[in-house]
Amino acid sequence: SPVPPSTALKELIEELVNITQNQKAPLCNGSMVWSINLTAGVYCAALESLINVSGCSAIEKTQRMLNGFCPHKVSAGQFSSLRVRDTKIEVAQFVKDLLVHLKKLFREGQFN
């Protein structure tokens, strides 16, 4: 049966915690991704940014989980208007920023 949205968000948060906790070397070899606007459509925007990182097993589960939250198909090279123009950050920082934002969404009951 489908997982309740609150449970799915909690699981995504815990996965991001695991990523930030378990990194010994730079996450995804220090790969850079587009920074995103966290105020709306965060799941699809985050997926659009992270999907351009390939060969990084540490974030594969996160990519799959974000895919479950995003209602449309996302493919590499696709950029929404939610991207912060010409600003790239390391995946590790991207994940930290995303984690804090998702914890706030959980607090506010915004599970979808």
Epitope: E14, Q21, E108, G109
Partner: antibody, heavy 122, light 108 residues
Framework: QMQLVESGGGVVQPGRSLRLSCAAS????????MHWVRQAPGKGLEWVAV????????HYADSVKGRFTITRDNSKNTLNLQMNSLRAEDTAVYYC???????????????WGQGTMVTVSS | SYVLTQPPSVSVAPGETATITCGGN??????VHWYQQKPGQAPVLVIY???DRPARIPERFSGSNSGNTATLTISRVEAGDEADYYC???????????FGGGTKLTVL
């Protein structure tokens, strides 16, 4: 300015009751979750109870559940804590605290009263 | 219920950096808040939502939260920073607010 003022503290015998009140001013009281936090002499902070901004939900620490009741009157900007069956371990400074209200009351406490002392002793 | 563990005391010389930790099972999944309390006074919020700082709090105060440990860092410590510091989270599972035991910061 924004203010929380507690009252009702004092010395009470074990097993008796006491009612604390908190008068809020300078902000939209009805839009905030309100908490009680206590601090025993020389000890750390202990959360006691919360009431949602509209009074629709209340939650309590296990140590006071079934004995304490938190209520609010949004028309009078007041918060109350009815304390029954008091024990010696309830002796503490009791703080009235404000927290912005979300779906869950995970917000930080951004305004504290100065506290009122409750002493439970025979 | 959820338990937060803080060291009872931390000592630091003026001008140095103080690090106060708050341990909890997967605390990185929670939003952590920090309070400063000076003797005879009510606590004051110094960091909220892991990393954010209220307007009146100096930039010397910063927070982080990852894995099983949240951290309050005070850089260029001053004598006036001497106080008790408490971490706090909301436990979603039990609908209760939880405080750490507190850390007494002593400025040598």
């Amino acid at each position: 300015q924004m203010q929380l003022v507690e009252s009702g503290g004092g010395v009470v015998q074990p097993g008796r009751s006491l009612r604390l009140s908190c008068a809020a001013s300078g902000f939209a009281f009805r839009t905030y979750g309100m908490h009680w936090v206590r601090q025993a002499p020389g000890k750390g902070l202990e959360w006691v109870a919360v009431i949602w901004y509209d009074g629709s939900a209340t939650h309590y620490a296990d140590s006071v559940k079934g004995r304490f009741t938190i209520t609010r009157d949004n028309s009078k900007n007041t918060l109350n804590l009815q304390m029954n069956s008091l024990r010696a371990e309830d002796t503490a400074v009791y703080y009235c605290v404000r927290a912005p209200q979300w779906y869950l009351s995970a917000e930080a406490f951004d305004l504290w009263g100065q506290g009122t002392m409750v002493t439970v002793s025979s | 219920s959820y338990v937060l563990t803080q060291p009872p005391s931390v000592s630091v010389a003026p001008g140095e950096t103080a690090t106060i930790t708050c341990g909890g099972n997967l605390i990185g999944a929670y939003l952590v808040h920090w309070y400063q309390q000076k003797p005879g006074q009510a606590p004051v919020l110094v960091i909220y939502d892991d990393v954010d700082r209220p307007a009146r709090i100096p930039e010397r105060f910063s927070g982080s939260n990852s894995g099983n440990t949240a951290t309050l860092t005070i850089s260029r410590v001053e004598a006036g920073d001497e106080a008790d510091y408490y971490c706090q989270v909301w436990d979603h599972d039990t609908n209760t607010m939880v405080f750490g035991g507190g850390t007494k910061l002593t400025v040598l």
